[in-house]
Amino acid sequence: GIAIPRNSGCPNSEDKNFPRTVMVNLNIHNRNTSTNPKRSSDYYNRSTSPWNLHRNEDPERYPSVIWEAKCRHLGCVKADGNVDYHMNSVPIQQEILVLRREPRHCPNSFRLEKILVSVGCTCVTPIVHHVA
Amino acid sequence: GIAIPRNSGCPNSEDKNFPRTVMVNLNIHNRNTSTNPKRSSDYYNRSTSPWNLHRNEDPERYPSVIWEAKCRHLGCVKADGNVDYHMNSVPIQQEILVLRREPRHCPNSFRLEKILVSVGCTCVTPIVHHVA
């Protein structure tokens, strides 16, 4: 849940909205360590299920830019560089929170929105349906 | 960019904070289709780089629960079920936005925060460092 006991040092909220409409400071705090070797990797190229990244832009959304992964192949890349179609490259999807302007074009009013983004790809064994 | 022209139908914002502090409606709108087969998949088990999911909980954060992936093996699973240590299972990480209560414990005041989460794993060819 999201509601927490009120504290005298907190901004007021009208109870009729509480806690549905909140104040959010957009000065982003970055919790990530300054240099994260895992993030600065080239997994997208080195994976057996490689992917390309596409810049998805939406000025009515915050953040307005999201990078989306698209798997390069239906199958997975073997050690010899050829694609094995007995395996499948599939996108790993993540549900993320974004802010959507509501009403549209308002600079300071948003609604939380859940969207599904493809973060990268993984190689899976296909589900084989046997015919009786 | 983040801010959009003020519209007479928009809530007011004090110019000193504009557009850093905004109003956000927490009634989440879900853009995802109600049942997404890819999301409700068992890729974490069927992948050549399988992973387990761990529940990360923080009541001062919204959402308070985030599931984090941890790769099961250092190597990748072969067709025969054995692990190939000539390949590496690695986490795919995604930078996501969450809301952090600020001041702490306040029910209706948040700050945006960027955090890095592991969404799943992929199988990659290792980088081989040759000694001269």
Partner: antibody
Framework: EVQLVQSGAEVKKPGASVKVSCKAS????????FHWVRQAPGQGLEWIGV????????AYNQNFRDRATLTADKSTSTAYMELSSLRSEDTAVYYC????????????WGQGTLVTVSS | NIVMTQSPATLSVSPGERATLSCKAS??????VGWFQQKPGQSPRLLIY???NRYTGVPARFSGSGSGTDFTLTISSLQPEDFAVYFC?????????FGQGTKLEIK
């Protein structure tokens, strides 16, 4: 201190290719997008495209899609812009600039690289 | 593509006076507009972002305003170092575009 240092001036013949580098320091290279912008002599600024060094993603201005290639080398914190099939109208100063994706603005710029295309 | 049109092309103002530069977008770009200063042989320097926010270290005499399609950069009291070319730029949607520039010269 954040710094973007670009490679030196280049003189190329029409039809040739040029590769301009931009070395970043003073921050985590993979955290921000890199955009490339050019400025022809006495003209305005024209956006070429963007690369995200953290994930390898690229996007291009349609006008440059077939000729420009953006790459990044994380080991040296260097971004590259290669332009092929050069013509005289490509004579310009080429800039790299850091873009804050969430905040939405270009904050730091390289010093610029003059590319002259002449037969 | 969104076209950013600046006016005037050249503006002659005396030091100590006020300068007002205009930028019009061919369609609404919200307030996703930045202003840059460029001196000969130098790279652009960010002054204003999101139409009205002064970037770190920029003197208070620089201010920006506007939303939608009409934007203004105002320099309240011109200093000798302010004479340069000024560009507006939109990052509302790619391809990101710039105005052709306004040259601010000493009268």
């Amino acid at each position: 201190e954040v710094q973007l240092v670009q490679s030196g001036a280049e003189v190329k013949k029409p039809g040739a290719s040029v590769k301009v580098s931009c070395k970043a320091s003073g921050y985590t290279f993979t955290d921000y997008e890199f955009h490339w912008v050019r400025q022809a002599p006495g003209q305005g600024l024209e956006w070429i495209g963007v690369i995200h060094p953290g994930n390898g993603g690229t996007a291009y201005n349609q006008n440059f899609r077939d000729r420009a290639t953006l790459t990044a080398d994380k080991s040296t914190s260097t971004a590259y812009m290669e332009l092929s099939s050069l013509r005289s109208e490509d004579t310009a100063v080429y800039y790299c600039t850091r873009f804050l994706t969430y905040e939405g603005y270009f904050d730091y710029w390289g010093q610029g690289t003059l590319v002259t295309v002449s037969s | 593509n969104i076209v950013m049109t600046q006016s005037p092309a050249t503006l002659s103002v005396s030091p100590g006076e006020r300068a007002t530069l205009s930028c019009k977008a061919s369609q609404s770009v919200s307030i996703d507009v930045g202003w840059f200063q460029q001196k000969p042989g130098q790279s652009p320097r960010l002054l204003i972002y999101h139409a009205s926010n002064r970037y770190t270290g920029v003197p208070a005499r620089f201010s920006g305003s506007g939303s939608g399609t009409d934007f203004t950069l105002t320099i309240s009291s011109l200093q000798p170092e302010d004479f340069a070319v000024y560009f507006c730029q939109q990052d509302y949607s790619s391809p990101y575009t710039f105005g052709q520039g306004t040259k601010l010269e000493i009268k």
